[in-house]
Amino acid sequence: RGVFRRDAHKSEVAHRFKDLGEENFKALVLIAFAQYLQQCPFEDHVKLVNEVTEFAKTCVADESAENCDKSLHTLFGDKLCTVATLRETYGEMADCCAKQEPERNECFLQHKDDNPNLPRLVRPEVDVMCTAFHDNEETFLKKYLYEIARRHPYFYAPELLFFAKRYKAAFTECCQAADKAACLLPKLDELRDEGKASSAKQRLKCASLQKFGERAFKAWAVARLSQRFPKAEFAEVSKLVTDLTKVHTECCHGDLLECADDRADLAKYICENQDSISSKLKECCEKPLLEKSHCIAEVENDEMPADLPSLAADFVESKDVCKNYAEAKDVFLGMFLYEYARRHPDYSVVLLLRLAKTYETTLEKCCAAADPHECYAKVFDEFKPLVEEPQNLIKQNCELFEQLGEYKFQNALLVRYTKKVPQVSTPTLVEVSRNLGKVGSKCCKHPEAKRMPCAEDYLSVVLNQLCVLHEKTPVSDRVTKCCTESLVNRRPCFSALEVDETYVPKEFNAETFTFHADICTLSEKERQIKKQTALVELVKHKPKATKEQLKAVMDDFAAFVEKCCKADDKETCFAEEGKKLVAASQAALGL
């Protein structure tokens, strides 16, 4: 029972233009183009979008007009390939234009860059931003879409429309406020942080689909939706999973118009069928479209039905386990995952998927055995260590976080991960470890029942960042192995890594540890990043350094920065005291 339109349209571009409306159509085409051609100037993209929009309007007026019957990939790809500087700016990506669809689109997708060489977005003064907003609101908001999309080439496009709506609302409200900065800056900070999180979550969905296939994504979706909608029947959850998979496949494949359209249809279906899905959807379903879709995606888990029977009857004790497994493997395993997940909102999705994989492996083995029932009778006992491993890990790390606080907890993780995979670039190790460390403040405050789904599923998102960044420039076989072997076992794989004994320590370079007065004007966050960068470099120079040694050096470093930032002649202080610090650190670490 798919909710999506199956009827053919003479003109796909006219169909989507009519469904989405001009404003959303233009915004989505801009996002699509910026996600493909990440280096192109804003003005070039706006020009391309306007041309596509004018063409779409001619097709709305007459669906039989020339080229209106072409696929969206053909139309958009042809348009992207008109960019004059394609070869100079993008190098081999220009070769995509020699290909035919669908290979051309696949080629563009392969050239998306998760870490594009773009300048950091610097936030202008509030008055400057408000003037720009008032002078040309439309251009101001388009620029926002463009800047986010080109830096986050897998950002979930319909969700980016929601962010843009909130961005506009923030400026509309705050540029009229008495204290513009006090009103606007916290809102922009919140949007930035939420945006980064949203981008990372979507990146994992796309990686799941692209690297591990539709079956892996569907398994993830069955588990998550079963936790969220435990009162919904399996057939209903299966239907939502099928439709959700279509939406994300489209967005991850660059089919943003179809994706946004289908997401709107799915939200409509969910709201029309609330009674058979979840009691928690009422408020979401009263909101306008973009807010509604966002709200549904974030909705809290419904209450579990009372008196759910034991799983053993159906999945261990039944005479028909092997018959069911043999005749309908994926449906039967899907049912197992649904039943287990709806009973366990306290488990992470990845844990549920590990349990389902263990169950599948056991049935594969046992259903070929002489006495299948005897063989699989104790399968649930195999789950115990799988459940206890993340529980113990979270308990230990939350204790460490509570003891150290976020910054020092991040530092502990920086040391831990640099020792595991010292070949990874320092900026990547800093970024990933800082994000791993945020799990503490994000999840440790929760009660036991919510800690694991919060922590382990968040860690999956962060480790995927490491995987996609590493894939661009692979330097460590251990990272490649953990990233590619099993999607659900990535975190246990990284957790199990010990110090890399094969690593040859980096040559000492005093320049790496030379600091200047500019550090004093940095924000607290930027200053932390500088210090954490130095810490990673220290570990790369001396991987066998003890915690105590590293702590001593870092304490000296913090004191040095504080002292020189208070000095009258800061630059001289940094030069002279810096030399002393380097010498003392070398002595302390035996470099």
């Epitope: 299966s238 159906d314 018959k323 005749e327 309908a328």
Partner: nanobody, 126 residues
Framework: EVQLLESGGGLVQPGGSLRLSCAAS????????VAWFRQAPGKEREFVAG????????YYADSVKGRFTISRDNSKNTLYLQMNSLRPEDTAVYYC???????????????????WGQGTLVTVSS
């Protein structure tokens, strides 16, 4: 809620045939597990045959394999049990039962079925 109404029972001679029907109302049973059970006088209710929902896998008790056939017509929301080569030991009240939300019969345990019809009597006697 699901209402189930069985029909088609009656008196038949050994070796004869009967076709039982079970009409469901209140919800579709096309995507859920449905089964026939029977209860002979003085005995426990026992599983006879079942059929999966979205996946049409059929299941039979060893005692009826090769003689009984379970099927359904989704357009009529009706479940059938075709009974051939009937024997005196097949005499019982036959019930249809539904497990909502289950696309497979994963148990032959009567306790796991949520909805039941009122039953139809089948008597096999010469």
């Amino acid at each position: 809620e699901v209402q189930l109404l069985e029909s088609g029972g009656g008196l038949v001679q050994p070796g004869g045939s009967l076709r039982l029907s079970c009409a469901a109302s209140g919800r579709t049973v096309s995507s859920t597990a449905v089964a026939w059970f029977r209860q002979a006088p003085g005995k426990e209710r026992e599983f006879v045959a079942g059929i999966g929902g979205s996946v049409d896998i059929t299941y039979y008790a060893d005692s009826v394999k090769g003689r009984f056939t379970i099927s359904r017509d989704n357009s009529k929301n009706t479940l059938y049990l075709q009974m051939n080569s009937l024997r005196p030991e097949d005499t019982a009240v036959y019930y249809c039962a539904v497990r909502p939300g289950r696309p497979l019969i994963t148990s032959r345990d009567a306790n796991l079925y949520d909805y039941w019809g009122q039953g139809t009597l089948v008597t096999v006697s010469s």
